[in-house]
Every structure is written in C-alpha cells, then in structure tokens.
Interface confidence: low
Amino acid sequence: TIPPHVQKSVNNDMIVTDNNGAVKFPQLCKFCDVRFSTCDNQKSCMSNCSITSICEKPQEVCVAVWRKNDENITLETVCHDPKLPYHDFILEDAASPKCIMKEKKKPGETFFMCSCSSDECNDNIIFSEEYNTSNPDLLLVIFQ
C-alpha cells in the first residue's frame, strides 16, 4: 500500500476513455488500507471502512485483500491500477462490478483477494459465488 505521504507518479495528463470512447472518471473505492477485521466464515462481509476515496487515476479499480493467520484477520481496501500487480498477483477480475474473493497461494496464511470496477464495490466482499441478489443496493455516496 502506498502511504499517504507518497505521491504516485503520473505518466501523462491524457484523458482516459473506455473501450467505447466515453470519458472514464475516477471511481469511488473504500480506502482504509489495512485494518483488523471480524469477517470470518461468512458468505459475504461489509468492509466496515468509513473512508471512501476518489481514486487518483481514472484507470484504477477497487481492491480488497482478506488475510487470516494464527494471530488475526485483516482486511485491506485500496484503489489500484489493474495494469500493475498487487501483492504480486494480477487483478484478473478488475472489470467485475462485484468484489468476488478468490483464494491465492501465500505461505503461512489464508489469502483472498478481489477487485472490481463499480463505485464502492470493495465495501461488500463476497466469498460465495452464489451472491444473494436480493440484498438492497448499497447507497453510493461520496466519502460516506
């Protein structure tokens, strides 16, 4: 995670567009970096992150990383550029509107990661593919 005082480099000031040529705006993601979590043995969890940030670059997506070891469980929420690996893994699901957790091999811990590209999508992390679509939509508000 890039600490708050380190400025990310910006390659250029070109306007970013999607595949259809529409201007792509920076999206909103939960951005609490690493915090302790009580999320365990559940089909889905809320991040309990109260900071929503406007991602710095239009191409960035939302990422959540769930880690469990012998001592604790943590949940990391950030913005990240899907062209770059995160925790040494490629963000394969960056285009998904929902954050569907996938297990990754990490020695000494249980490690799940997901990425997604709708506003605040890393607020609701889903461990079961059978996502309950009857859940009410999250209120998409800035910084809330």
Partner: antibody, heavy 121, light 107 residues
Framework: QVQLVESGGGLVQPGGSLRLSCAVS????????MSWVRQAPGKGLEWVSA????????HNTDSVTGRFSISRDNSKNTLYLQMNSLRAEDTAVYFC??????????????WGQGTLVTVSS | DIQMTQSPSSLSASVGDRVTITCRAS??????LNWYQQKPGKAPKLLIY???SLQSGVPSRFSGSGSGTDFTLTISSLQPEDFATYYC?????????FGQGTKVEIK
Amino acid sequence: QVQLVESGGGLVQPGGSLRLSCAVSGFNFRRYAMSWVRQAPGKGLEWVSAISASGDRTHNTDSVTGRFSISRDNSKNTLYLQMNSLRAEDTAVYFCAKGLAASGKNYFDPWGQGTLVTVSS
Amino acid sequence: DIQMTQSPSSLSASVGDRVTITCRASQSISSYLNWYQQKPGKAPKLLIYAASSLQSGVPSRFSGSGSGTDFTLTISSLQPEDFATYYCQQSYSTPPTFGQGTKVEIK
C-alpha cells in the same frame, strides 16, 4: 512554488449569494481532490465541501447542503464555491485546501490564505 | 459525526519548554489523526499526519503519538515561532472533524 489564492469574499445580506474562487498554481491541479474549510471569527475549523479531481463528484457538510455548491475549472486551475441563501452563521474565513480524497490522502495540505465572508444586515 | 476534544484549550509556556497537547476522539479512529498549526491571520499548516508521521519541512521538535481515541502532540523544546493555535483533525470517517484548538501563549 505551490500557491492557493482565494477571492470573492465580502459583506452580504442574509439570504444573499456569493461566489468564492481559489486560483491554484505550483501543482497539477487536475490530479487532486480539493476542499473548502471555514473558520468563524474566533472559532475553530470546519470542513465545508469537497470535489473530486475530475469535478464529477462533490460532497458537502450537512449544514450547507442545498445552499452551497462546489465546482472547479481544470482548464483555469480554479476552484469555486457558490454560496446561496446565506445565513449569519455562515460568517467565516473560507480557506481552500488541497486534499481529502485522492488515494487515501485524507489530510489538508496546503491551504490558501483565506477570504472573509460576512453575512449581516 | 466524530467529536474531537482537545485539552487544554490554552496554555502558557516559555521558550525551551516541553509542551504536550492532547486530543481525544469520541470513538476509535485508529491512527487517522492529523495535527495543524495556525498563527493569527494565517492559514493552518499541516504538521503531523497519520498520528505520528512528520510532514515534510516540519522541524523534528514536533512529534505525534497515540492511536484509538487518545492522541498527543509534543513540542520537545518550544521556540518563539511555535506560539500559535494547534488543531487536531480526524480522517477516519466523513465528515472530517477538527478539535476546538489549543492556544499556546508566551508565559
């Protein structure tokens, strides 16, 4: 050298309107979220409003929602605060500041020198 | 909203003194706490972010500590230019909120 220079403050009657401006230089304005923070005479600091780097998203503190509107012109490196239906309790020095919401940079730095808004009949 | 309470509201000190200002949050804010210095008629200036990280260009006599609900700003040896008002600010949740300020005056 980073500079934020506010203007547009002044004396206005209750119910009136003002538009504040903040001219920015010395950093890549279009890459950063910006905020307005105010300070009533002799009082502490209160965050008022924020806007995303691209200008497509804004957020206000509850007490000004529906009355104040933050905007920006990235081609002019300028931040604005349109203040309508002004009340006596809106009397304050208004500061513009870089920050709040870009990639977890949830602090304000740097700040402009401020512009005084006085609401009085 | 999270309430931030600073103490004391004012203090008198001499050049060379060690000064400590405390800030308490109404709920746990982890380490999401910033400190600012403001001189009369001037804009606030960021001193410390994330509870203990010194902002670039700020003298090392300033330090911050704490996590959860209780935080401290310490000036190890007060200098003439340090007489000012100091504010804490939480960035754990929106809206960001400030303490009421602590005025450091010359004894």
